[in-house]
């Protein structure tokens, strides 16, 4: 029997390479049974995850799963960092794994670093 707990399917240690100035949608895949839970996004600052209050979000519904989307329109250099979604379900807080955005600022980067350079040498993001 399938569990009716809410589950947040952000992949563990997932990473995204994105360009400043581009639009980007960060998806939080949500599985639920009956009532859609209240889901929020936060951005990690050290060990604290700061709730993103004034950001554009939306839901996308598919057959077996729903997506709570955080919109970046456009991506800004300071959007670089790790994000997490969380859901309130039956008085419980369910937290996703964090997902990391590596933002390349096209104005200051003469050549776009590879995804692996950004993962292993994050200072490239701030040149």
């Amino acid at each position: 029997k399938e569990s009716c707990d809410v589950q947040l399917y952000i992949k563990r240690q997932s990473e995204h390479s994105i360009l400043a100035g581009d639009p980007f949608e960060l998806e939080c895949p949500v599985k639920y049974c009956a009532n859609r839970p209240h889901v929020t996004w936060c951005k990690l600052n050290g060990t604290t995850c700061v709730k993103l209050e004034d950001r554009q979000t939306s839901w996308k519904e598919e057959k077996n799963i729903s997506f709570f989307i955080l919109h970046f329109e456009p991506v800004l250099p300071n959007d670089n960092g790790s994000y997490r979604c969380s859901a309130n379900f039956q008085s419980n807080l369910i937290e996703s794994h964090s997902t990391t955005l590596y933002v390349t600022d096209v104005k200051s980067a003469s050549e776009r670093p590879s995804k692996d350079e950004m993962a292993s040498r994050p200072w490239l993001l701030y040149r």
Epitope: K11, H97, S98
Partner: antibody
Framework: QVQLQESGPGLVKPSGTLSLTCADS????????IHWVRQPPGKGLEWIGR????????RYNPSFKSRATISSDKSKNQASLKLSSVTAADTAVYYC?????????????WGQGTTVTVSS | DIVMTQSPDSLALSLGERATINCKSS???????????LNWFQQKPGQPPKRLIY???KLDSGVPDRFSGSGSGTDFTLTISSVQAEDVAVYYC?????????FGQGTKLEIK
């Protein structure tokens, strides 16, 4: 049923490029990570790297960083490995493996492996 | 890189004896999510590795309960309570917490 199947040339010339494909069935690769692991004759297992097929983001073992390229094709449900400037030391059995998703994140399914010999 | 050191490199036991394989990591494998991504694989000649144990102690489906895993932080153990002929194989630990992922060098189990 989850299956992974590696394929590619069994013989590669020194200084050439090794190219392998991992054809996956029974699951959607974009929901997982695909890893490549190799095993030289009579030796242990060596992790080469992994890809997130959902967005193409890769991670490599620094030992292979400059020579390895992992890619994926969601439409074909397959992943690929290219290893450039090969030498005899790259002779090995090459495996692709799936990292299952929530909540365990471990290599739960492997291909049978394909033997690659580097020789002129 | 995280170095995974297994001991012993090989062991030869009689049928029914207890096998203990140790794996030591150079750093803690406890992840930020509170889980420890330490796995054990069994590899028989001419076959790909097969997952036996994940998250330190969870047994894969179909794996006999004579296999067990334990440990935390940097020290882990695979135990076979009563070795059977079909357990002859090489056993590898693997860490999935840090990049790059790393395997132990392997422990070869033989029957005396």
């Amino acid at each position: 049923q989850v299956q992974l199947q590696e394929s590619g040339p069994g013989l590669v010339k020194p200084s050439g490029t090794l190219s392998l494909t991992c054809a996956d069935s029974g699951f959607n690769i974009k929901d997982t990570y695909i890893h490549w692991v190799r095993q030289p004759p009579g030796k242990g297992l060596e992790w080469i790297g992994r890809i997130d097929p959902a967005n193409g983001f890769t991670r490599y073992n620094p030992s292979f960083k400059s020579r390895a390229t992992i890619s994926s094709d969601k439409s074909k449900n397959q992943a690929s490995l290219k290893l450039s400037s090969v030498t005899a030391a790259d002779t090995a059995v090459y495996y692709c493996a799936r990292e299952d998703g929530y909540p365990y994140y471990t290599l739960d399914a492997w291909g049978q492996g394909t033997t690659v010999t580097v020789s002129s | 890189d995280i170095v995974m050191t297994q001991s012993p490199d090989s062991l030869a036991l009689s049928l029914g004896e207890r096998a203990t394989i140790n794996c030591k990591s150079s750093q803690s494998l406890l992840d930020v999510d509170g889980k420890t991504y330490l796995n054990w694989f069994q590899q028989k000649p001419g076959q790909p590795p097969k997952r036996l144990i994940y998250l330190v102690s969870k047994l894969d489906s179909g794996v006999p309960d004579r296999f067990s895993g334990s440990g935390s932080g940097t020290d882990f153990t695979l135990t076979i309570s009563s070795v059977q002929a079909e357990d002859v194989a090489v056993y590898y630990c693997w860490q999935g917490t840090h990049f790059p992922r790393t395997f132990g060098q392997g422990t070869k189990l033989e029957i005396k």
